[in-house]
């Protein structure tokens, strides 16, 4: 039975080179979290955490990605090709599954701020 | 390796309480829900609730509200079912059970403890 | 409350037989949380099948499940003389988390 709700940080936007913070949070629910796996768009698996193990950062992702806040994930050293779908996935007893969606785009520097970097005084 | 070992088997005269236990190994007890059956004599096995192990709160099922409390000790890791006023009905095996997800299951059993209530 | 409701209520067969257990819901069992249970007298419950049909760890592969919505089975292949023992199925589609009354498996 099915009585929780995901909410996520939705559509969010950051600069390329700067990094992201990824939320999930279960609420409506008494359910216990067993596990919550961060998968990105092409259904890569960036992260675990599990209750009884703790963080799992995939081998791929090790350099660019933090653990938290929270069961949270932080995306570091953003490229173009991170813009994308991001889901998280609970796991849950006894509700089961649920899952949670966030679309990241990475936005290029402006113009502006990149000609501002480069000013002579 | 994982496994929940409960109190041994009870005796009591109705109007009593008892207090049955149910220890965690090979495991984190705050790493998985930990849910309560009921098998009475000869009969089929009853989901009495759960107790989330993370933050205490226990969920009873109609029928066992009220007699009933699941409780925790996570320094001995160990959970605790206590039924109150107890009544010739309650005789029964009281079995807790690990639950695990995702599906939900329940997937580690204690070996049971036998509750008795006679006069 | 979804009510699960077994058949046959005993099954007399002889090792080597294939056993088919069948468990019915009153209502659409939500994902197929459906869960199958191996219980020998004297003895706690032991989980032999997980979401209809996901086989627990250690368990022999002569036992599936399958099904889906209000009907469920489970099947055991080649019967060893360990498997005569009580089965129930359970459901967690739906609050309170019900189990059927049983299948007794029984040697003929």
């Known amino acids: 039975m099915m009585t929780g709700t995901i909410e996520t940080t939705g559509n969010i936007s950051a600069k390329k080179g700067g990094s992201v913070i990824l939320q999930c949070h279960l609420s409506s629910t008494m359910a216990q979290v067993t596990q919550v796996n961060w998968e990105q768009h092409d259904h890569s698996l960036l992260a675990i955490r599990n209750a009884e193990l703790g963080w799992h950062i995939y081998p791929a992702f090790k350099d660019r990605v933090a653990p938290g806040p929270g069961l949270g994930l932080t995306l570091q050293s953003l490229t173009m090709n991170d813009t994308g779908e991001y889901f998280c996935t609970y796991h849950t007893y006894p509700d089961g599954t649920y899952r949670g969606r966030i679309f990241l785009e990475v936005l290029e520097s402006s113009v502006a701020e990149h000609s501002a970097r480069f000013q002579i005084p | 390796q994982v496994q929940l070992v409960q109190s041994g088997s009870e005796l009591k005269k109705p109007g009593a309480s008892v207090k049955v236990s149910c220890k965690a190994s090979g495991y984190t007890l705050t790493s998985h829900a930990l849910n309560w059956v009921r098998q009475a004599p000869g009969q089929g096995l009853e989901w009495m609730g759960w107790i989330n192990t993370n933050t205490g709160n226990p969920t009873y099922v109609q029928g066992f509200t009220g007699r009933f409390v699941f409780s925790l000790d996570t320094s001995v890791s160990t959970a605790y079912l206590q039924i109150s006023s107890l009544k010739a009905e309650d005789t029964a095996v009281y079995y807790c059970?690990?639950?695990?997800?995702?599906?939900?299951?329940?997937?580690?059993w204690g070996q049971g403890t036998t509750v008795t209530v006679s006069s | 409350e979804i009510v699960l409701t077994q058949s046959p209520g005993t099954l007399f067969l002889s090792p080597g037989e294939r056993a088919t257990l069948s468990c019915r819901a009153s209502?659409?069992?939500?994902?197929?949380?459906l869960v199958w249970y191996q219980q020998k007298p004297g003895q706690a419950p032991r989980l032999l099948i997980y979401?209809?049909?996901t086989r627990a760890t250690g368990i022999p592969d002569r036992f599936s499940g399958s099904g889906s919505g209000t009907d469920f089975t489970l099947t055991i292949r080649r019967l060893e003389p360990e498997d005569f023992a009580l089965y129930y199925c359970q459901q967690y589609g739906s609050s309170p988390f019900t189990f059927g009354q049983g299948t007794k498996l029984e040697i003929n």
């Open positions: 059970a690990r639950g695990y997800s995702s599906p939900p299951r329940m997937d580690v």
């Open positions: 209502q659409s069992v939500s994902r197929n949380y």
């Open positions: 979401g209809a049909s």
